[in-house]
Structures are given as structure tokens and as C-alpha cells.
């Protein structure tokens, strides 16, 4: 006869491991007992369980409540056992010793591998600001056994670097994603992808990029200077900019206070029916936590009774 087992049994942490040991004997041969022991190199054998043809299953105290026979129907030549709720410390070499009649004793070894699936974590780097050089966008760490694979999935152009730390029974892998921040990256997903044999599918953690920036400011509304004449209603100036975080707007008049009746509504400055007192230099001040910008325009309200048109100057400053 001969023993049938597996060289390696692989199980995921927390699952039950079936340790196979089947005696393929000639007709008339009987199995008296099957003794299971853990036999890691450098350590003495540690008894696990005994399957006895008469006495039944005995589980050694160290494994009490964790070793069972597979459910019926059972073949008397089958010495397989179930190791319940496998933990990382169970990883190692196991031996089954089969005592048969009349053929004598046989033994076989197998290796139990306990896969520890990773629980990845993603940590965003420092705040990203337009104009910075190569900057850490995020780091992703996953620890498992064996070492997990950590990669990145993104449309954003960048560079990655990985490092690994080996522990006694596992390995931690950290991958960093660096980029040169630009406003086009704002709102783009950066996904950490973790692969591991203990996972049914890759684990993915997505981070949305936020890049701080503030565009140049400009003022719209004076494109046709002839519209700015005494008595005109509904005249307005609009300050144009964009940024992350979204900017706030403030209007001032360089050569004095804002005239009465002039309404400030965020990025818009609304005028009452125009009079000559509305002529002057107006400044739009745009700011966010990252930066601030100014744009100024000169308003010259025309008197339709005067023949000569007046020029309007637009000046932008930051």
C-alpha cells in the first residue's frame, strides 16, 4: 500500500484546512491508527490528533476544539483531518503516520500554507499645489502573507516607488505615487490596487486628487465701451477666475469708495442707471487659501451729448 497526501495545502486565514492522508492499501489491509503531528524543522514533533480505528478521534490538548474528522461518510482508510479556523501560527510542516495491518507503518509529510489577505490603507500626501515640483500624492500600504502586490491605476502622469518590510510571518509593502501637480489633475482618481493569492479579487482604494491653484483674474463687461453711457440700466462687471478651493471675490474702487447704489454679488458688480459719478477705476480681488489675484478696469461713463468718444483702459495685475 501507499499513502496519498498533498505536498502543500493552502488555506486562507480563518478558514478550515483539510489535511489529507489516505492509505491506498491492498485488499484485506486495515488501518489501526493515524497519528498527526506538527514537525517543523528544529523543533520536536507536537502531537495534533490521533484517529484510532477503535477509540475514535483524540485531539491533543494544544489543539482541543480545533481538530475534527471530515463529515461522514468516512472511509476507514482515510486519515484526513480538518484543522478549524487556521491561524498564521499553524503554518508549517505536518506529518501523518499510518499504522496498518499487516503491512506496517507509513508516513507522509505536507506543508500547510496560511494565506493572510492584506487590509490595505491609503494615505494622501501633503496638500498638492500648482507650481510645486515632484510631490507625494499618496502612499498605499498592505501587509499580508505572502507579500502582496501594490500597484496604481490612474490616468494621471506620475512615478511610483515601492519598499517592503519583512516580518516574522508576513511582509508589508508600501508604494508611493509622486507627481508634479497641475490644475488638470484636479478631481482625477488615483487608485491603489492590491493583489494577493488570498483575495478573490483585487482590492482597490480610490483617492480623488485635489490640486490647489488660482487662475489669473480678468473682468468682463466693458467689451463695448459705447454701451457705458449716462442713463444706461443694467450695466455690470463680471470678474472671471477659477481655482481650487473655489475662490471668493471682492470688489473695490481704487479712487474712492464704491458709489451708492452699486451692488456687489460675488463675482458681479451691478450698477444702477449710469451717471458720471460711476466713472473710475474698479478692482476685482480674487483669493483662495492658495493665492490671490487682482484685476482692475477703468470705467468712463459717456455723455451722449458729447461728440467725442472716450477711451476705456483695461489693466490686469496680480
Amino acid at each position: 500500500g501507499e499513502l496519498e497526501t498533498s505536498d502543500v495545502v493552502t488555506v486562507v486565514l480563518g478558514q478550515d484546512a483539510k489535511l489529507p492522508c489516505f492509505y491506498r492499501g491492498d485488499s484485506g489491509e486495515q488501518v489501526g491508527q493515524v497519528a498527526w503531528a506538527r514537525v517543523d524543522a528544529g523543533e520536536g514533533a507536537q502531537e495534533l490528533a490521533l484517529l484510532h480505528s477503535k477509540y475514535g478521534l483524540h485531539v491533543s490538548p494544544a489543539y482541543e476544539g480545533r481538530v475534527e474528522q471530515p463529515p461522514p461518510p468516512r472511509n476507514p482508510l482515510d486519515g484526513s483531518v480538518l484543522l478549524r479556523n487556521a491561524v498564521q501560527a499553524d503554518e508549517g510542516e505536518y506529518e501523518c503516520r499510518v499504522s496498518t495491518f499487516p503491512a506496517g507503518s507509513f508516513q507522509a509529510r505536507l506543508r500547510l500554507r496560511v494565506l493572510v489577505p492584506p487590509l490595505p490603507s491609503l494615505n494622501p500626501g501633503p496638500a498638492l499645489e500648482e507650481g510645486q515640483g515632484l510631490t507625494l500624492a499618496a502612499s498605499c500600504t498592505a501587509e499580508g502573507s505572502p507579500a502582496p502586490s501594490v500597484t496604481w491605476d490612474t490616468e494621471v502622469k506620475g512615478t511610483t516607488s515601492s519598499r517592503s518590510f519583512k516580518h516574522s510571518r508576513s511582509a508589508a509593502v508600501t508604494s508611493e505615487f509622486h507627481l508634479v501637480p497641475s490644475r488638470s489633475m484636479n478631481g482625477q482618481p488615483l487608485t491603489c490596487v492590491v493583489s494577493h493569492p488570498g483575495l478573490l479579487q483585487d482590492q482597490r482604494i480610490t483617492h480623488i486628487l485635489h490640486v490647489s491653484f488660482l487662475a489669473e483674474a480678468s473682468v468682463r463687461g466693458l467689451e463695448d465701451q459705447n454701451l457705458w453711457h449716462i442713463g444706461r440700466e443694467g450695466a455690470m462687471l463680471k470678474c472671471l477666475s477659477e481655482g481650487q478651493p473655489p475662490p471668493s471675490y471682492n470688489w473695490t474702487r481704487l479712487d474712492g469708495p464704491l458709489p451708492s447704489g452699486v451692488r456687489v454679488d460675488g463675482d458681479t458688480l451691478g450698477f444702477p442707471p449710469l451717471t458720471t459719478e460711476h466713472s473710475g477705476i474698479y478692482v476685482c480681488h480674487v483669493s483662495n487659501e492658495f493665492s490671490s489675484r487682482d484685476s482692475q478696469v477703468t470705467v468712463d461713463v459717456l455723455d451722449p451729448q458729447e461728440d467725442s468718444g472716450k477711451q476705456v483702459d483695461l489693466v490686469s495685475a496680480s
Partner: antibody, heavy 126, light 107 residues
Framework: EVQLVESGGGLVQPGGSLRLSCAAS????????MSWVRQAPGKGLEWVSG????????RYADSVKGRFTISRDNSKNTLYLQMNSLRAEDTAVYYC???????????????????WGQGTLVTVSS | DIQMTQSPSSLSASVGDRVTITCRAS??????LAWYQQKPGKAPKLLIY???SLQSGVPSRFSGSGSGTDFTLTISSLQPEDFATYYC?????????FGQGTKVEIK
């Protein structure tokens, strides 16, 4: 025919010592695990100690741990029980017994006691 | 330690009676259970091992059953030489432990 014969019992004062012997014959002594079991007068059976056939694996009941020592000399087919620091509650008939040999090379379990000696009485009294 | 509880502690019966003694373990012991017979002034004698296997030379009127925690020794037809004290013993763990005994007396 399997025979187990105990000797060495007797009267001893509390705190004293005794060494029991068990001479085995009629079978291959070093193929079998052995045990000592005692029975106080009018009481039930209590397992005292056991020793495996070849290994140095020895086990003791909590009540005698640290005071009693089991040993065997396979060349003399003899089992021993060294009893020190004896107490009144150790008074009993001490039996040596052979363990049934149908479990092979597995120390975590003991087996039934298929042959017993006639017993030797140990009396601890002042 | 595993506790073994026998019942009854004693019983009176007549020759020819069917006698049943039960033994309960405080935890599961598979079939790691033996039954012994002891007569006054004599050493115990193994009757049944592995809960239900008859030891060589023991009359077939003795039988055992059970596994796990509950076990039974049955004497199908009591004979005069069967009046004795009977003990169950578990050998699943060390220390092996005995029941307190059941004394079978003549009615």
C-alpha cells in the same frame, strides 16, 4: 502468562519515603507503557503515574506531583515508584498495571489497563 | 481533569437479571473508555475497552456501548460470579480518571 508482582509496601511515618517495585514477566516488557494506580481503603481507584515504553515521557496525578517519581529498567523488566514526603492520605493499596498496546507512538493518550498486579499496601501513619 | 460519574452507586439484582450501569464524562472522550470489574481483595480486571470492545477471555454476556459523553455497561444475564464492583475509566486525557464505582449486590 503475563504476571506483575509488586513489592516494597509497608508502614512508614508521615514525611518518610518508600520505593515500590513491580516485576513483570510473560511478555516483552519494553513494548508496553506502564502505570501505577492506587486504592485507599474502602474507596475507588485513582491513577497515580504512568511511563511510556521507550521515551522518557512520565506523567503524574496532581496529588503526587513533585513527591513521587516513576521509572523503569527495561533490562530488568521492572517498574518503580519512588515515594517521598509521604502523607496519611497516600495510604492505599498500590497496583502496577500494564497499558494495552493498541496505540502506537502517541504520547498524548493513555490506553486501558489490561493486566494488573495483586497490589502492595502502603500505610502512612505515625 | 475529566470527571466520570457512574450511576447507580449500588444496585441489588438476582441471578439471570439484565443489569445496566451508566457512566457520563464531563466532556467528550470519543470512545476512549474502559470498564473494569473488581472483587473484594483482588485487583481490577479489564472487561471492555474502546467503549464496546470485549477484552479477550471476558464472557459475551458483558457488553458496552456509547461514545462522546454517555456510556453503558450491560450484563445481559447476571451470573453468581458477576457480583462485584464495576468502574468506568476514561483515558482520553491525562490524568486518566475513574468513576466512583457501582457495587452490584445479590438481592
Amino acid at each position: 502468562e503475563v504476571q506483575l508482582v509488586e513489592s516494597g509496601g509497608g508502614l512508614v511515618q508521615p514525611g518518610g519515603s518508600l520505593r515500590l517495585s513491580c516485576a513483570a514477566s510473560g511478555y516483552t516488557f519494553d513494548d508496553y507503557d506502564m502505570s501505577w494506580v492506587r486504592q485507599a481503603p474502602g474507596k475507588g481507584l485513582e491513577w497515580v503515574s504512568g511511563i511510556k515504553a521507550h521515551s522518557d515521557n512520565k506523567r503524574y496525578a496532581d496529588s503526587v506531583k513533585g513527591r513521587f517519581t516513576i521509572s523503569r529498567d527495561n533490562s530488568k523488566n521492572t517498574l518503580y515508584l519512588q515515594m517521598n514526603s509521604l502523607r496519611a492520605e497516600d495510604t492505599a493499596v498500590y497496583y502496577c498495571a500494564r497499558e494495552y498496546s493498541d496505540v502506537v507512538d502517541y504520547v498524548s493518550v493513555r490506553t486501558p489497563l489490561d493486566y494488573w498486579g495483586q497490589g502492595t499496601l502502603v500505610t502512612v501513619s505515625s | 481533569d475529566i470527571q466520570m460519574t457512574q450511576s447507580p452507586s449500588s444496585l441489588s439484582a438476582s441471578v439471570g437479571d439484565r443489569v445496566t450501569i451508566t457512566c457520563r464524562a464531563s466532556q467528550g472522550i470519543s470512545s476512549y473508555l474502559a470498564w473494569y470489574q473488581q472483587k473484594p481483595g483482588k485487583a481490577p480486571k479489564l472487561l471492555i475497552y474502546a467503549a464496546s470492545s470485549l477484552q479477550s477471555g471476558v464472557p459475551s454476556r458483558f457488553s458496552g456501548s456509547g461514545s462522546g459523553t454517555d456510556f453503558t455497561l450491560t450484563i445481559s444475564s447476571l451470573q453468581p460470579e458477576d457480583f462485584a464492583t464495576y468502574y468506568c475509566q476514561q483515558h482520553y486525557t491525562t490524568p486518566p480518571t475513574f468513576g466512583q464505582g457501582t457495587k452490584v449486590e445479590i438481592k
